[in-house]
């Protein structure tokens, strides 16, 4: 079997064996090593010497195998765009951002660039639970049978109707999707002015 070529090596067809970790250098028509994440090219390759890499300076990073001669500036998450930091920048990774609580990603360009407030879900509904927080706006779904939700809110969850008998009470009015069951003392008639749940 042929020995594996080690950079730098000649390439007539302008392609390299390992596209992730090597690149074609057209001036010398050779394949050279890229620099690993967290580093940059401090000396370009030649026919007799491979790429020389150096570590990114403080406050900078390179995320991928690269042939950049410089590193990218670490930047903060922009709070005005509704973003917050979940992990600081390192030499190998840019600052990791996510939408602030109560917001969703409204503009995506390789990563989230702009978050907006989640829409309210009206009474009788709740936001459908998503796999990933902040990924999309609220999709409001009706409360399931036996549950209610009585506010306009982006995050309120449907709650089970009160079971009057559990409290030694009797039902005065059934619960709806927007209101809880109304309970009363079994010994007393419900006064006309009383509306809403009787709390023990």
């Amino acid at each position: 079997s042929q020995p594996q070529a080690v950079p730098p090596y000649a390439s007539e067809n302008q392609t390299c064996r390992d596209q992730e970790k090597e690149y074609y250098e057209p001036q010398h028509r050779i394949c050279c090593s890229r620099c690993p994440p967290g580093t940059y090219v401090s000396a370009k390759c030649s026919r007799i010497r491979d790429t020389v890499c150096a570590t990114c300076a403080e406050n900078s990073y390179n995320e991928h195998w690269n042939y950049l001669t410089i590193c990218q500036l670490c930047r903060p998450c922009d709070p005005v765009m509704g973003l917050e930091e979940i992990a600081p920048c390192t030499s190998k990774r840019k600052t990791q951002c996510r939408c602030q609580p109560g917001m969703f990603c409204a503009a995506w360009a390789l990563e989230c660039t702009h978050c907006e407030l989640l829409s309210d879900c009206p009474p009788g509904t709740e936001a459908e639970l998503k796999d990933e927080v902040g990924k999309g706006n609220n999709h409001c779904v009706p409360c399931k049978a036996g549950h209610f939700q009585n506010t306009s809110s982006p995050s309120a969850r449907c709650q089970p109707h009160t079971r009057c008998e559990n409290q030694g009470l009797v039902e005065a009015a059934p619960g709806t999707a927007q209101s809880d069951t109304t309970c009363k003392n079994p010994l007393e008639p419900l006064p006309p002015e009383m509306s809403g749940t009787m709390l023990m």
Epitope: E58, N59, S60, Y67, L68, T69, I70, C71, Q72, L73, C74, R75, P76, D78, P79, V80, E85, P88, C89, T95
Partner: antibody, heavy 120, light 113 residues
């Protein structure tokens, strides 16, 4: 020493387009973001957008979105800024600029500027 | 975008006197993780492109005379020329690079009184 040399002055009619070039020498062209900044007569500096040649991705100011196109040709170490649907308010000096210490940091190298006059 | 506001718009100072220019950003340009302010100052003379004077709010670019100094943090910044020279007559701009959408102040014109 890094140098950014821009194309010559242009006179354009309203509604037409202009394409300004910026040729870099003395440094690694593709590793640095090139920004375009304009300055109307007697006015301040206004960032229009930029491109990282090695990635080919451009990034535009909201004000110019849809009207400006920034490109780069790595083989000639040249960046281009094309502005369409020209109006008289686009009369300005257009500069290309790039950082030196970071790929996308503060701007420390500037071209000499290209005067674009929009007049009927 | 971050809005940068400079004051005053123009300033007349006697030769050898101190000139002070202020710059305010609409939001903080301080990155708490590295405690750096993403702010630069530029000088522009008539018919010339801008020239970088200061970055990281207070670090002088090499070759810039030490009479130029930058200070401030968060949203409030100052460029000081400790002893104005004739060659300092120019327009001065602050600029943020906290986001990749760079923005500039409207400029402050410095003249000799």
């Amino acid at each position: 020493q890094v140098q950014l040399v821009q194309s010559g002055a242009e006179v354009k009619k309203p509604g037409s387009s202009v394409k300004v070039s910026c040729k870099a020498s003395g440094g690694t062209f593709s590793s640095y973001a090139i920004s375009w900044v304009r300055q109307a007569p007697g006015q301040g500096l206004e960032w229009m957008g930029g491109i990282i040649p090695i990635h080919g991705t451009a990034n535009y100011a909201q004000k110019f979105q849809g009207r400006v196109t920034i490109t780069a040709d790595k083989s000639t170490s040249t960046a281009y800024m094309e502005l369409s649907s020209l109006r008289s308010e686009d009369t300005a000096v257009y500069y290309c600029a790039r950082p030196s210490y970071y790929l996308d940091g503060w701007l420390d190298y500037w071209g000499q500027g290209t005067t674009v006059t929009v007049s009927s | 975008d971050i809005v940068m506001t400079q004051s005053p718009d123009s300033l007349a100072v006697s030769l050898g006197e101190r000139a002070t220019i202020n710059c305010k950003s609409s939001q903080s340009v301080l990155y708490s993780s590295n405690n750096k302010n993403y702010l630069a100052w530029y000088q522009q003379k008539p018919g010339q492109p801008p020239k970088l004077l200061i970055y990281w709010a207070s670090t002088r670019e090499s070759g810039v005379p030490d009479r130029f100094s930058g200070s401030g943090s968060g949203t409030d910044f100052t460029l000081t020329i400790s002893s104005l020279q004739a060659e300092d007559v120019a327009v001065y701009y602050c600029s943020q690079y906290y986001t990749t959408h760079y923005t500039f102040g409207q400029g402050t014109k410095v003249e000799i009184k």
